[in-house]
Interface confidence: low
């Protein structure tokens, strides 16, 4: 092809090529043609004769002002036609007369201000019609019943002011899954306007200034329709009462979006008419008081989003939002509750009472004063089968005994990014019989005891990153009870002292993070009593991170038991010489990181076993000694391996001898070296 189109699998991409005409030299069997973002003014039908197999044609973002009716005659198999962002202003009855197989027609962002006659009458298979971002002043798209298979009608960002039954009755035989009318200036819903449509399942009226009064009228018009999904985001619905949604009593609404409404007052029984509702979006509102009956009637809601719904009006404590006890008791089917980023004063004793199906609860950054978690804090969740609880970013400083004793089903507890500073006696976790993960990273300080985790033997993941961990060197180890542990993160704690039994019994451990500590002394031969083999027995370890620990020595048998190690990170240490058989048992090693150490020599007797099955190697920024003895074997291995070695050309440079300083290691000439073959 002389044009710069890319063709792959019968798809031709000719976008962004400044084309002024349709290419005439593409393969004739293409089924998809993308001509977007060019300078096409017209689409001569004759130019498409050779592309009769097209099922999808996208000519968006051009300057097309007119369409030849014959175009579709040349494209009998066309299903998707995208004309968005062009300059179409008039559609005649002939425009799409031959486009009988279309399932999608995209006309958004043109200059269509009025639809005359019946330009879409032949589109019996059309599923999606997008007329958004035009200048339409009404929903009138024809004068006779048509578009019986239409499922999505997108009319957002137009100038529609009223919905009238006589304009919508062309959809008398249609089942609309989505009627998108967002960002219009609708001020009127004439009687029967929605009943004119055969079946209406989804109505989207976001960014329409409805207010409480017009919302009420809207809902009355929706009575006895098939409506399932209703979206009224940013519709200036500042208050709701027990009549606002009355009309929806005669529907089976399952989704309601009231987000971004600055909703201030939610009156009792506001939603009593919505017993079928399953998904309720209330995020980004301004509710000042949730009454005990505000949510009454929502017996089937499974998902409720209250993120940033309760925010304080001023710095005064008196202005904090209130949530009455038992406010959620009606939500018997609720499984997922998001209450992130709020200004709720605290958790009352019956705040969550009645949520008998709740599985996921996010309370991240939700409270103004949740400094201490007591044995009463979560009593209202005693009968909830909670699996995941997120308590991050709440400035929690203390967890008292039995704080979670009510949460016997809990699997994931996230307490990260708080200000917890205390000794962990072990009583904090009492009752967490099914706990799988406790995330405690990024807290003030944690002092461990031998019983810190004695009551949670089911724990599989424990995250203790940057918590100024104290007493980790006690014996028996605080981790001894955690026989099921698979992931342990002890990084960023400046740990300097640990015993060789710290990880004793953790035979299922798979991931161990110890980066950014101060463990160098433990592996020195001069250490009183000799090196400390704290990795012994971890026969199932897959990933080991020991980066940034100041190591300048590695004992020969330190990795002896780590038969299944796949990834090891020893980067940013001070390692120079490694003992000959240090990696002999790492037959499964896939990734080795030794970047930014002081390694000068890469010899077969040390690295041969480790390199055998490697898929990734990182030894950048080491001061390699480019002599036969030091790197001949390495260079030959580099040049024959399939292992991924990022930045090999630029960051593997010789340091010595002086005449090789700065020279790329891989270019070192090994031909004069003896016995340097990497493979035998």
């Amino acid at each position: 092809s002389t044009t710069k189109c890319t063709v792959s699998h019968e798809v031709a991409d000719c976008s962004h090529l400044k084309l002024t005409q349709v290419p005439d030299d593409l393969p004739t069997n293409i089924t998809v043609l993308n001509l977007t973002h060019n300078q096409l003014r017209r689409l001569p039908a004759a130019n498409f004769t050779r592309y009769s197999q097209l099922t999808s044609l996208d000519v968006g973002f051009n300057t097309i002002s007119k369409l030849e009716p014959e175009l579709c005659q040349k494209l009998p198999m066309l299903k998707v036609l995208n004309l968005q962002h062009n300059e179409l202003s008039q559609l005649s009855d002939k425009t799409f007369a031959f486009c009988t197989n279309l399932t999608e027609l995209h006309l958004m962002s043109n200059s269509i201000q009025k639809i005359k006659n019946n330009p879409f009458v032949k589109q019996k298979n059309l599923i999606t019609l997008d007329l958004s971002h035009n200048g339409l002043s009404s929903t009138k798209l024809g004068t006779q019943v048509q578009l019986e298979n239409l499922q999505e009608l997108l009319l957002s960002n137009n100038k529609i002011q009223a919905l009238k039954s006589e304009e919508l009755d062309i959809f008398a035989n249609s089942s609309l899954k989505k009627l998108e009318l967002s960002s219009n200036q609708i001020k009127e819903f004439s009687p029967g306007c929605f009943h004119a449509i055969g079946r209406l399942f989804g109505l989207f009226l976001n960014n329409v200034q409805l207010g409480p009064s017009l919302t009420e009228k809207l809902c009355l018009e929706l009575a006895n329709t098939s409506i399932r999904n209703l979206s009224l985001s940013n519709s200036q619905l500042s208050t709701t009462s027990n009549t606002t949604f009355l009309g929806l009593k005669w529907t089976n609404l399952t989704m309601l979006d009231l987000s971004y409404n600055n909703l201030n007052v939610v009156g009792n029984d506001s939603f009593a008419w919505l017993p079928q509702l399953e998904y309720f979006f209330l995020e980004y509102n301004n509710i000042q008081h949730l009454f005990s009956h505000s949510l009454h009637g929502l017996f089937n809601v499974r998902y409720l989003n209250l993120k940033r719904s309760f925010t304080k009006q001023s710095i005064s404590l008196a202005s904090l939002p209130k949530i009455d006890d038992f406010s959620f008791q009606w939500l018997k089917c609720l499984e997922h509750l998001n209450m992130e980023d709020n200004d709720i004063p605290g958790i009352k004793s019956n705040m969550f009472t009645g949520l008998i199906n709740l599985k996921y609860l996010s309370l991240s950054n939700s409270f103004t004063s949740l400094r201490t978690l007591t044995n009463e804090t979560f009593v209202s969740l005693a009968h909830s089968p909670l699996h995941i609880l997120n308590l991050t970013k709440n400035k929690i400083s203390k967890i008292e005994s039995d704080a979670f004793s009510w949460l016997g089903h809990l699997e994931v507890l996230d307490l990260g990014l708080n200000e917890i500073g205390q000794e962990l006696t072990g009583q904090e976790w009492r009752g967490l019989e099914n706990i799988f993960e406790i995330y405690l990273s990024y807290n003030k300080y944690l002092q461990l005891t031998r019983n810190s985790f004695a009551l949670v033997p089911s724990l599989q993941r424990l995250m203790l990153r940057r918590v100024a961990l104290k007493n980790v060197d006690s014996s028996p180890s605080p981790f001894q009870p955690l026989r099921n542990l698979t992931i342990l993160d002890l990084s960023n704690n400046n740990i300097a002292n640990i015993n060789d039994d710290m990880l004793e019994g953790l035979e299922k451990l798979e991931i161990l993070d110890l980066q950014h500590n101060n463990l160098a002394r433990l592996w020195k031969h001069a250490n009183p009593g000799g090196p400390i083999y704290f990795l012994k027995g971890l026969s199932h370890l897959h990933i080991l991170n020991l980066e940034s620990n100041g190591f300048d020595e590695i004992p020969v048998e330190v990795f002896k038991d780590l038969f299944e190690l796949k990834i090891i990170d020893l980067g940013l240490n001070n390692l120079n010489t490694l003992p000959a058989s240090v990696f002999n048992n790492q037959v499964s090693l896939k990734s080795l990181n030794l970047q930014k150490n002081l390694i000068t020599s890469v010899e077969k007797k040390v690295f041969g076993p480790a390199f055998r099955n490697l898929t990734e190697l990182d030894m950048r920024f080491n001061p390699f000694d480019c002599t036969c003895e030091s790197i001949a074997w390495f260079v030959n291995w580099i040049n024959e391996t399939h292992t991924n070695i990022p930045e090999l050309s630029s960051h593997y440079l010789c340091n010595t001898p002086p005449h090789y300083h700065g020279f790329p290691v891989r270019l070192f000439d090994t031909s004069s070296c003896k016995d340097s073959a990497p493979f035998e």
Epitope: H387, N484, H542, E564
Partner: antibody, heavy 119, light 107 residues
Framework: QVQLVQSGAEVKKPGASVKVSCKAS????????IHWVRQAPGQGLEWMGE????????NYNEKFKTRVTMTRDTSISTAYMELSRLRSDDTAVYYC????????????WGQGTLVTVSS | DIQMTQSPSSLSASVGDRVTITCRAS??????LAWYQQKPGKAPKLLIY???TLADGVPSRFSGSGSGTDFTLTISSLQPEDFATYYC?????????FGQGTKLEIK
Amino acid sequence: QVQLVQSGAEVKKPGASVKVSCKASGYTFTTYWIHWVRQAPGQGLEWMGEINPNNGRINYNEKFKTRVTMTRDTSISTAYMELSRLRSDDTAVYYCARVGVMITTFPYWGQGTLVTVSS
Amino acid sequence: DIQMTQSPSSLSASVGDRVTITCRASGNIHNYLAWYQQKPGKAPKLLIYNAKTLADGVPSRFSGSGSGTDFTLTISSLQPEDFATYYCQHFWSTPFTFGQGTKLEIK
């Protein structure tokens, strides 16, 4: 090598129960969770639940919670999955599977047990 | 529950073709995604785990990518033995749902 050997095919009447066994060998039985997955004829895979042979802890798919019972006998390294109140749409091949050391995958599967529910 | 949506549901291709199958999760599953190959009358066989790690013994023409909610299985050059049904499965939280499957057929 790791092997999961399941019991033979079963034909059951509606309303009855079926108990499928899965005998493990080649590794320490108590070390890894056993999962149960079923596949109706011509259909996709459906995860039913998992059991920890070490302590018998179970996570069921809510869909099966009221009818499925997963048990194990560590003395013979065998896991069991019992499905009660059988219906015709329970006709399927039932597989047991085991996680790897990396707990986010099923590298090991039984050969499958065909359970036919028919009156 | 997290739903897994696979596309396409079926796919015709020829030996030597490059094939891509996608899997979308209804929520964030990080990289806890596995891909399996299943042939008629056989148990599924693990291909990829943790979104992109090749299982032992699996040919390097198979590769996985993605994280969060969108994942891809790619077969760089189809071989005759690759015609089968492929499933994705997440391991983020129970239930560990599978995608509905993609049947890869010979064109």
